[in-house]
């Protein structure tokens, strides 16, 4: 509360996250023409990626391009992109929405239509949705724990989220445990009354609010985090503003002499510890 | 502007970015001692990387050292590096500028000059400049859309930059379209009075500033950003500071059983969005 | 100092860093049954990786566990997890300590300990204690260079904390060259009150602060930074709330058409740049 | 020591059985994964089959997954190879060796992660 004799002081907040999980993974898996149930287990090392304190990623979807090679071929059919004739390619342009540049010829994509040629990454990447349910929806289940240092210089004082008569065991919950910093993610999204399962598909972004409301003062003094939780990512996005969140990433590889890639679509929940409040002293 | 009878509080703000855009690169490959030119195609899982919501980069340019082995080997003959006899080499020491560790050897590294032999990734990387115009120079033509949610906790209040009624084929014009989030990466440089082209052959750090000023009161609610854009690293920058902005990293990959690896020097742009402003009500 | 006629803005900050340093790592190379020493050079692109503006990372000792592909294998045995029957392994779950699923069987480990069956990347992490002393212990002689720009946008005014006049060859001392923006990782550690060595075998957060106070009125005009130096992370913390830094990240790799990975847990020393301050004008 | 013998090898008919034993001593050879190779003639040896120390998980070549079977007696220091459903392209000689390592989960089919072949025993399939 605003206590106006205090002098107020914004806090200086530093972010330490460690994700904790396996997923197990079956998907249709084709080699030799043959298609099969595959089985694959994720861990962290598989799932997410050694990013920035204030931010954390959780893989929770992908689809896979495999064994790209730089050469031409024909771009993928989506609405709008099918030709009939070389008149509607044009030579050296770059569609935003496709993955080359185009040579000018019309060429056969499959037996019935026939796509512009461009030069790319071949083949071009199958803008197919994303699997559903998503194929790392077991993730739900991962617990992230969560360590935060803050400091007030201008009152020279320091402190953290997590006290020494903590238990490594426990996990939050608004009423039972609400100092416990360790999190699972599933109880992160029914907290903030949005459905894993669903975002999973998709991906999108969740903010972990921690606010420090400190009073310094000798006689009152109290500086514990509150933790609440928000969607950031807006679930009635427009497509042609990308909803969900993913991005692409590539594994390069040589074979016989010719570098190709895996090119891995990625969807998942980036977690966005947000940091905020004062500390004031009289 | 400020209004004296309002409570003011600082911006709790998230940042997504998606860049869109290909590249079409030509440079000289040497394979088995014939140079040709190579053309290839990049896209953003090529020239740009996972990073955090505040910042993304995109790769502009870059210089290669291909099959890099640990091994025994000259060092690069930058000025001051040459050596006549082996008095001039120091087992054991480092030179910063150097990539490896002196073996105390005086070696020939080519018909003309002698340098100290070092235990590195041979054969060392050469300190040639940054290709000249940038490699991606075309990445002047690529897009960037931003979405930006903020929050005044104290206010309750939640918005974003992005809303319902707006069109996702729309580009940033600071007059014709200035609420517009899809932003073309030479007009920001336009706009901050810069030369991509130029630029682009060092690298360098690019500000996009957000700034929200928003009166939350119901009777004269205003609350939309403002976008302005500044270059951040120091074009006039002394040599020995490092100018423009650059990273090295490495492909690592096994060949007849010897662990090898290509070291990619990056030049690019890093783009910080720095967002700010506050939220103020009666 | 405070003064109260003025109006007071908080910074607005970017940061750039490039670090520098080689490291010759000893340590312990099994081949074909054979164990002898081997010798390995680390540059930047093998112990940092291209991350955001406010924080990098500094890798100081490393685990692998080399060729983990996906089959079943016997778990590690780490404290309570040997079994003695079948009884003791249940089908599908998930242990968060462990790194697979179990099958349910109880299977030999090595001759003395049996320990659950798990769906893993095999064979699984042996829990072993980071190598003591740190393998790239010598990090403590790298230097890293910070260049910050910071900027006031209601005063309309902008600085940096390297000045033309600066020399790129200094390094920063709190008595003899306090403005020197380039920093030994060990002199950061020394004026932390923190000892390097001990640090750099389980990894940490080190927090590099830099305080602007800054007056910028034209009579009495100052706007220098101020640096200063803390831990971050906890070291007197608990064995459950996972103390030091470290992360674990795979490469993965294909042999005889067999998806293989090898899996590197990287301790190091996380470096958090903390930009705070204000400018006051009349 | 270790001395890897080979034992079992001769001519059978296409369709036909034969089971290859390998003794070893020297030295116990029950910490180790252990494995069949074979070689043609005018052809490089090639991995066949392979079993880890403990007798739990066992690894084949696509072409006798199914028809082949590896096995162990640590009790006895003894490997096996039960071979049914043979067919002329398994005519070669068959070596056992010993697993050296590291990490037999990856390397369970590369030749040089072995060591001490034995002198090897001929299996010859006529159709």
């Known amino acids: 509360s605003d206590k106006l004799y205090q002098r107020k002081e914004p806090v200086i907040s530093s972010v330490h996250t460690k994700v904790k999980g396996i997923a197990e993974v079956t998907e249709n898996v084709t080699e030799g023409g043959v298609t099969k149930l595959g089985h694959s287990i994720f861990d962290t090392a598989d799932y997410t990626f050694p990013l920035q304190g204030n931010s954390f990623f959780v893989m929770t979807n992908y689809v896979k391009s495999e064994g790209q090679v730089q050469t031409l071929c024909p771009e993928y059919p989506r609405r709008g992109a099918q030709c009939s004739s070389d008149r509607r390619c044009k030579k050296g342009w770059m569609d935003p929405q496709s993955k080359g540049i185009q040579t000018g010829r019309c060429v056969p994509y499959d037996k019935t239509r026939k796509t512009c040629e461009v030069s790319a990454w071949c083949p071009t990447e199958e803008e197919k949705e994303a699997p559903r349910p998503a194929l790392l929806r077991s993730a739900e289940n991962f617990t992230v724990l969560i360590k935060n240092n803050i400091h007030f210089p201008g009152h020279n004082y320091t402190t953290r989220n997590i006290l020494p008569t903590m238990n490594g065991s426990c996990t939050f919950h608004k009423t039972w445990d609400p100092q416990c910093s360790i999190f699972r993610l599933g109880d992160i999204f029914q907290e903030a009354g949005e459905n894993f399962t669903e975002v999973a598909v998709q991906g999108g972004i969740m903010g972990i609010e921690i606010y420090w409301d400190c009073n310094l003062d000798s006689w009152s003094h109290h500086c514990r985090p509150r933790y609440s939780f928000r969607r950031l990512d807006d679930k009635n996005m427009d497509e042609s503003f990308v909803p969900g969140y993913n991005f692409r990433y590539a594994k390069y590889y040589k074979e016989n002499n010719v570098e190709k890639r895996t090119l891995i679509k990625a969807f998942g929940i980036r977690f966005d510890i947000l940091v905020f409040g004062t500390g004031g002293k009289f | 502007s400020d209004k004296l009878y309002q409570r003011k509080e600082p911006v709790i703000s998230s940042v997504h970015t998606k860049v869109k855009g290909i590249a079409e690169v030509t440079e000289n490959v040497t394979e088995g001692g014939v140079t040709k030119l190579g053309h290839s195609i990049f896209d953003t899982a090529d020239y740009t990387f996972p990073l955090q919501g505040n910042s993304f980069f995109v790769m502009t340019n870059y210089v290669k050292s291909e099959g890099q082995v640990q091994t025994l080997c000259p060092e690069y003959p930058r000025r001051g590096a040459q050596c006549s006899s082996d008095r001039r080499c120091k087992k054991g020491w480092m030179d910063p500028q150097s990539k490896g560790i002196q073996t105390g050897r005086c070696v020939p590294y080519d018909k003309t000059r002698k340098t100290c032999e070092v235990s590195a990734w041979c054969p060392t990387e050469e300190e040639k400049e940054a290709p000249r115009p940038a490699l991606l120079r075309s990445a002047e033509n690529f897009t960037v859309l931003i979405k930006n949610n903020i929050h005044f906790p104290g206010h309750n209040y939640t918005t974003r930059n992005i809303l319902p009624t707006m069109n996702g084929s729309c580009t940033f014009h600071k007059t014709w379209d200035p609420q517009c989030s899809i932003f073309r990466l030479g007009d920001i440089f336009q706009e901050a009075g810069e030369n991509f082209t130029e630029v682009a052959v060092q690298g360098g750090i690019m500000g996009i500033e957000i700034y929200w000023d928003c009166n939350l009161d119901s009777w004269s609610h205003h609350c939309r950003p403002r976008y302005s854009f500044r270059r951040l690293d120091d074009k006039n920058m002394d040599e020995s500071f490092v100018p423009g902005y650059n990273f090295r990293y490495a492909k690592y990959y096994k060949e007849n059983n010897v662990e090898k690896r290509t070291l990619i020097k990056a030049f690019g742009i890093r783009f910080d969005i720095l967002v700010f402003g506050t939220g103020g009500k009666f | 100092s405070d003064k109260l006629y003025q109006r007071k803005e908080p910074v607005i900050s970017s940061v750039h860093t490039k670090v520098k340093g080689i490291a010759e790592v000893t340590e312990n190379v099994t081949e074909g049954g054979v164990t002898k020493l081997g010798h390995s050079i680390f540059d930047t692109a093998d112990y940092t990786f291209p991350l955001q503006g406010n924080s990098f990372f500094v890798m100081t000792n490393y685990v692998k566990s080399e060729g983990q592909v996906q089959t079943l294998c016997p778990e590690y045995p780490r404290r309570g997890a040997q079994c003695s029957s079948d009884r003791r392994c249940k089908k599908g779950w998930m242990d968060p300590q462990s790194k697979g699923i179990q099958t349910g069987r109880c299977v030999p480990y090595d001759k003395t300990r049996k320990t659950c069956e798990v769906s893993a990347w095999c064979p699984t992490e042996e829990e072993k204690e980071a190598p003591r002393p740190a393998l790239l212990r010598s990090a403590e002689n790298f230097t890293v260079l910070i260049k910050n720009n910071i900027h006031f946008p209601g005063h309309n005014y902008t600085t940096r904390n390297i000045l033309p006049t600066m020399n790129g060859s200094c390094t920063f001392h709190k008595t003899w060259d306090p403005q020197c923006s380039i920093f030994r990782l060990g002199d950061i550690f020394q004026e932390a009150g923190e000892n390097f060595t001990e640090v750099a075998v389980q990894g940490g957060i080190m927090g590099i602060e830099i305080y602007w106070d800054c007056n910028l009125d034209s009579w009495s005009h100052h706007c220098r930074p101020r640096y200063s130096f803390r831990r971050l992370d906890d070291k007197n913390m608990d064995e459950s709330f996972v103390p030091g830094y470290n992360f674990r990240y795979a490469k993965y790799y294909k042999e005889n058409n067999v998806e293989k990975r090898t899996l590197i847990k990287a301790f190091g020393i996380r470096f958090d740049i903390l930009v705070f301050g204000t400018g006051g004008k009349f | 020591e270790v001395q890897l013998v080979e034992s079992g090898g001769g001519l059978v008919q296409a369709g036909g059985s034969l089971r290859l034993s390998c003794a070893a001593s020297?030295?116990?050879?029950?910490?180790?994964?252990m494995g069949w190779f074979r070689q043609a003639p005018g052809k490089l040896r090639e991995f066949v089959a392979s079993?880890?120390?403990?007798?739990?998980?066992?690894r084949y070549i696509d072409s006798v997954e199914g028809r082949f079977t590896i096995s162990r007696d640590n009790t006895k220091n003894t490997l096996y190879l039960q071979m049914n459903n043979l067919k002329a392209e398994d005519t070669a000689v068959y070596y056992c060796?010993?697993?050296?390592?590291?990490?037999?989960?990856?390397?369970?089919?590369?030749?040089?992660?072995?060591?001490?072949y034995g002198q090897g025993t001929q299996v010859t399939v006529s159709s």
């Open positions: 060796a010993y697993f050296l390592g590291p990490n037999w989960y990856s390397n369970y089919g590369r030749p040089s992660s072995y060591d001490f």
């Open positions: 079993i880890n120390w403990s007798g739990i998980y066992t």
């Open positions: 020297g030295r116990t050879v029950s910490d180790y994964g």
